[in-house]
């Protein structure tokens, strides 16, 4: 990763944040859809 001068720590943190963001968006969309259908 970047010629080995970086640890992979920051990338792992950011990947986990991206997954959280994605899941929050998907769940938020589903919730809005459920409310709309009611």
């Amino acid at each position: 990763h970047s010629d080995g001068i970086f640890t992979d720590s920051y990338s792992r943190y950011r990947k986990q944040m991206a997954v959280k963001k994605y899941l929050a968006a998907v769940l938020g969309k589903r919730y809005k859809q459920r409310v709309k259908n009611k």
């Epitope: 970047s2 640890t7 920051y10 990338s11 986990q16 944040m17 959280k20």
Partner: antibody, heavy 117, light 113 residues
Framework: QQLEQSGGGAEGGLVKPGGSLKLSCKAS?????????ICWVRQAPGKGLEWIGC????????DYANWVNGRFTLSRDIDQSTGCLQLNSLTDADTAMYYC??????WGQGTLVTVSS | AQVLTQTPSSVSAAVGGTVTINCQSS????????LSWFQQKPGQPPKFLIY???KLASGVPSRFSGSGSGTQFTLTISDVQCDDAATYYC?????????????FGGGTEVVVK
Amino acid sequence: QQLEQSGGGAEGGLVKPGGSLKLSCKASGFTISRDYWICWVRQAPGKGLEWIGCISAGGGSTDYANWVNGRFTLSRDIDQSTGCLQLNSLTDADTAMYYCAGNLEIWGQGTLVTVSS
Amino acid sequence: AQVLTQTPSSVSAAVGGTVTINCQSSPSIYSGAFLSWFQQKPGQPPKFLIYEASKLASGVPSRFSGSGSGTQFTLTISDVQCDDAATYYCLGFYDCSSVDCHAFGGGTEVVVK
């Protein structure tokens, strides 16, 4: 293998209150990957470090500190291995050394920004 | 907003002695361990020392060690050398969906006698 900063000049980029300035940060001696993040941190004279925000080299995703409030904008050019920080509506309180930091591990030498009339 | 409180703000140590710096976070650090430590000398950018609370960055002497998890973290400098005189900062990583992704502690100045 370092980050080279330009824009204000280590000797001092003088800007008037309300003015704007663009700082840049270029990777030197290594290639940045898509999962690399360019972060910006500032340090007012005699004070501590303050996180500004980060941008991903690949997708251009950004995260800003709440206090930034839209005044600063991050951008990047992965082909040029460069990240930029656009500073707008500057006030005296923005006078600081501005650092870029790759993955918050490797740091640029800093760019001094002085806001004064 | 999150707060990282570093104590003490200044500490004096004799050559060969030991220094302990504390960093307390509110809320808890992401995954309990995403916390880094930096050393900064006057006129220089910060230097990366420790990541994920206890892992030593490349080229950092083993005199430096980090510990802790959740909200309480410690940086210990053993066998203190004159070259260790600097200001030390902790950096917290947080859940970006609820607070700012990162925050620095206020810094601890280490004076070597």
